[in-house]
């Protein structure tokens, strides 16, 4: 799988998951979250070539076209498979509320 | 919805289906299927502004991201959305069989 | 600029449903809670909760908690606020109105029209 | 919930004069270092207007006339010179805990 146990410990140039930190203040302008103060919410980053964990019949069929139209603008992207919650405080007065924000990580990714 | 019915009739820049036929022998290789001889099998392309068809909460996150750091690698990426398969017909010796392919067709387009 | 505008005025029957629409621009719809508060003829201002449209996170005010659904559509930047079982004394100009964004709960900087929502039988 | 009572409720006031409304808490709205008061401007079938945020800050494009003071349960909101245009009803809005509450207003008229 394109998880972050494989695609953090390689130096894979194909689709994988790379690490992204993002701050709530400077990356987001969101500054009502308490903590944390931002999170690892990573990225997919690579190319698609032909069988590389192709999500569906689809894009192994892009992925063989494109394999044969080398340079054809159609081609399978690199996005994220399994994403998980992030858990945030944030006060409502000051009463402290703890939520998850659901899908905030991304853990794995595909070609689709 | 980014649809063939919204996207093959505008001129829309940002992610949107687009239309592409594939020739099934002379774009795949397959030279197995009797009919048809291609099909129009569409695929997903443009960018992924703040707000456009966002499809998750990380989504929303990253293209929010983008917008403050414009110019870094992490943006999300337009890809399918709705399926569709498509009917073929083959010969198994001299016995057509007819069978559904199932996600061959690219309805409609999605920011992931 | 920043605006918010709202729906058109609605008169509605007791026990019925309303649902007021708020569509903001000229800002970031997504990093910024949207706040719902009204005011009934004559009176002061009530405020009935406010949401956070990225994540859909919401605050109620408990007079009005199981009764009030507030949801945004971030690819229309919309807001939306729905009442139900409404009484007579719901009758008010309903408001959106956009938090400044250091707290969840806030000062408002920005202000809808209003939406005059009338319940008579 | 946090009561917040505004005097006087109406008052009548000629241009130039120098106008005060109080507002108080049923118990204190300070937090980390702030005042978590603001005040509004609201004029006749208008929607509200930020004026004060934060008991004392002015918010953009708001004249310096207005002005906002006080701490724990007391504040003032000050008009130094009042100006035709101020005619209005003015509210205090505490957002220390929730439900977010206002006070009933206080309406300046015109003498």
């Known amino acids: 799988a394109l998880d972050t146990n494989y695609c953090f410990s390689s130096t894979e140039k194909n689709c994988c998951v790379r690490q992204l930190y993002i701050d709530f203040r400077k990356d987001l302008g969101w500054k009502w979250i308490h903590e944390p103060k931002g999170y690892h919410a990573n990225f997919c980053l690579g190319p698609c070539p032909y069988i590389w964990s192709l999500d569906t019949q689809y894009s192994k069929v892009l992925a063989l076209y494109n394999q044969h139209n080398p340079g054809a603008s159609a081609a399978p992207c690199c996005v994220p498979q399994a994403l998980e919650p992030l858990p945030i405080v944030y006060y409502v007065g000051r009463k402290p509320k703890v939520e998850q924000l659901s899908n905030m990580i991304v853990r794995s990714c595909k070609c689709s | 919805a980014l649809d063939t019915n919204y996207c093959f009739s505008s001129t829309e820049k940002n992610c949107c289906v687009r239309q592409l036929y594939i020739d099934f022998r002379k774009d795949l290789g397959w030279k197995w299927i009797h009919e048809p001889k291609g099909y129009h099998a569409n695929f997903c392309l443009g960018p992924c502004p703040y707000i456009w068809s966002l499809d998750t909460q990380y989504s929303k996150v990253l293209a929010l991201y983008n917008q403050h750091n414009p110019g870094a690698s992490a943006a999300p990426c337009c890809v399918p959305q709705a399926l569709e398969p498509l009917p073929i017909v083959y010969y198994v010796g001299r016995k057509p069989k007819v069978e559904q392919l199932s996600n061959m067709i690219v309805r409609s387009c999605k920011c992931s | 600029q920043v605006q918010l505008v709202q729906s058109g005025a609605e008169v509605k029957k007791p026990g019925a449903s309303v649902k007021v629409s708020c569509k903001a621009s000229?800002?970031?719809?997504?990093?910024?809670?949207m706040n719902w508060v009204r005011q009934a003829p004559g009176q002061g201002l009530e405020w009935m909760g406010q949401?956070?449209?990225?994540?859909?996170?919401?605050n109620y005010g408990e007079m009005f908690e199981g009764r009030v659904t507030m949801t945004t559509d971030t690819s229309t930047s919309t807001a939306y606020m729905e009442l139900r079982s409404l009484r007579s004394d719901d009758t008010a100009v309903y408001y959106c109105?956009?938090?400044?964004?250091?707290?969840?709960?806030?000062?408002?900087?920005?202000w809808g029209q209003g939406t005059l929502v009338t319940v008579s039988s | 919930d946090i009561q917040m009572t505004q005097s006087p409720s109406s008052l009548s006031a000629s241009v130039g004069d120098r106008v005060t409304i109080t507002c108080r808490a049923s118990?204190?709205?300070?937090?980390?270092?702030?005042?978590?008061m603001h005040w509004y401007q609201q004029k006749p079938g208008k929607a509200p207007k930020l004026l004060i945020y934060?008991?004392?800050n002015l918010e953009s494009g708001v004249p310096s006339r207005f002005s906002g003071s006080g701490s724990g349960t007391d504040f003032t909101l000050t008009i130094s010179s009042l100006q035709p245009e101020d005619f209005a009803t003015y509210y205090c809005?505490?957002?220390?805990?929730?439900?977010?509450?206002f006070g009933g207003g206080t309406k300046v008229e015109i003498k």
């Open positions: 109105a956009r938090g400044i964004g250091n707290y969840a709960l806030d000062a408002m900087d920005y």
């Open positions: 000229g800002y970031t719809f997504t990093s910024y809670w």
């Open positions: 949401i956070f449209p990225a994540s859909g996170s919401t």
């Open positions: 118990e204190s709205v300070d937090f980390w270092g702030n005042s978590f």
């Open positions: 934060l008991a004392s």
């Open positions: 809005q505490q957002n220390i805990e929730d439900p977010l509450t």
